[in-house]
């Protein structure tokens, strides 16, 4: 039994690091393998992660962590019974994939404005809480070409757009993801999408109605 592709890990910089690797043949990851991990720090204990299968020869392990600081370094040992298959290390701050934002809501009750809000996936005591920026994806269910991305580079987890920038009378969906420049993170997964019906009075209709009104006076 050998490791074909060495473990690579990403951290949510809060409580979970996910490591994936490939073996040289079909493997029952949970019964045949164990990934031991230990923070290189005083009093730290070794923890055991039981991997799950991720395709025939692929394995994935979710390493649980109480907290994280920038300087953290973990030793990783992959065992098959008494045989050490691979030994390595992992610095969570160098491989961050943020948690996905949640609770995406579209508020349509503001006159001619769409307000999208979502929740920051980190608590205030986490460094990433004040360092996330977002990308909001809005697309039409009716027209695949009507697909747009809004970059939210301020800290506020919200976006205001004029309803008139979208077509009226059709349904749209939105989703949001996050990243943090400070740790050069990858993008998070997309949040679950939310759907709304975009309806507002077209500017042309308003203009036409106004003109018609004047004509009668």
């Amino acid at each position: 039994m050998k490791v074909l592709q060495e473990p690579t890990c990403v951290s949510d910089y809060m409580s979970i690091s996910t490591c994936e690797w490939k073996m040289n043949g079909p493997t029952n990851c949970s019964t045949e393998l164990r990934l031991l991990y230990q923070l290189v720090f005083l009093l730290s204990e070794a923890h055991t992660c039981i991997p799950e299968n991720n395709g025939g020869a692929g394995c994935v392990c979710h390493l649980l962590m109480d907290d994280v600081v920038s300087a953290d370094n973990y030793t990783l040992d992959l065992w098959a019974g008494q045989q050490l298959l691979w030994k390595g290390s992992f610095k969570p701050s160098e491989h961050v994939k943020p948690r996905a934002p949640g609770n995406l809501t579209v508020h349509t009750n503001v006159s001619d404005t769409l307000l999208l809000t979502w929740s920051n996936p980190y608590p205030p005591d986490n460094y990433l809480y004040n360092h996330l920026t977002y990308a909001v994806n809005i697309w039409s269910e009716n027209d695949p070409a009507d697909f747009r991305i809004y970059n939210v580079t301020y800290l506020e987890p919200s976006l205001r757009i004029a309803a008139s920038t979208l077509k009226s009378g059709i349904s749209y969906r939105a989703r949001v993801r996050a990243w943090a420049q400070c740790y050069n993170t990858t993008w998070s997964e997309w949040s679950p999408s939310t759907k709304w019906h975009n309806s507002y009075r077209e500017p042309f209709e308003q203009h036409h109605h106004h003109h018609h009104h004047h004509h009668h006076h």
Epitope: M14, S15, F41, L42, D66, D67, V69, S70, D72, N130
Partner: antibody, heavy 116, light 112 residues
């Protein structure tokens, strides 16, 4: 041996500023969060705030926000707490504590007395 | 802010007898990572506090097994199965799950 050694007692006048230090040995402060805890005479423990020494990220209890500044110098393995606009109710022992992820190591405390 | 309320505030126990201290939080102290950072500290006279229990039930290294922690949600308990003279001092519960972190007001343990 792990130790947190704090600077000596201070006597300050109301309105003044005090800065106390906490030098760590036996571990690198970059590997922990450094916290400060207040204990007024005959009273209980009160969390003041904390810093991640590597990136300088701080959070403070709202009661102290605006008057307290926690800093760290990783080159000397030392954390600092500065408290400004001192008043009599700031008279207390201030402990530095390393947290990873619980308060395993405490400094001996620094008594700050505010008196006119 | 989360308020941690300890009862009783003082306790007088005969050596060899058990003691129990309760700590109630004003709201859930489950962290968003799923863990409950409820800890117990003992401050002996003239000393800095020392860690006894972390994450509700885990004894810190070197802490005698007569100390045990239990609880969940908002109700937590520290038990000493047989009190010894060296256990005197003030016991504090602490929540490190939500900012601002908060201590209980303390429970003073004396020996009869």
């Amino acid at each position: 041996e792990v130790q947190l050694v704090q600077s000596g007692a201070e006597v300050k006048k109301p309105g003044a500023t005090v800065k106390i230090s906490c030098k760590a040995s036996g571990f690198n402060i970059k590997d922990t969060y450094m916290h400060w805890v207040k204990q007024a005479p005959g009273k209980g423990l009160e969390w003041v705030g904390r810093i991640d020494p590597t990136n300088g990220y701080t959070i403070y209890a709202s009661k102290f926000q605006g008057r307290v500044t926690i800093t760290a110098d990783t080159s000397t393995n030392t954390a600092y707490m500065e408290l400004s606009s001192l008043r009599s109710e700031d008279t207390a022992v201030y402990h530095c504590v390393s947290r990873r992820p619980w308060f395993a190591y405490w400094g001996q405390g620094t008594l700050v007395t505010v008196s006119s | 802010d989360i308020v941690m309320t300890q009862t009783p505030l003082s306790l007088s126990v005969t050596p060899g007898q058990p003691a129990s201290i309760s700590c109630r939080s004003s709201q859930s102290i489950v962290h968003s990572n799923g863990n409950t950072y409820l800890e117990w500290y003992l401050q002996k006279p003239g000393q800095s506090p020392q860690l006894l229990i972390y994450k509700v039930t885990n004894r810190f290294s070197g802490v005698p097994d007569r100390f045990s922690g239990s609880g969940s949600g908002t109700d937590f308990t520290l038990k000493i199965s047989r009190v010894e003279a060296e256990d005197v001092g003030v016991y504090y519960c602490f929540q490190g799950s939500h900012v601002p972190y908060t201590f209980g007001q303390g429970t003073k343990l004396e020996i009869k």
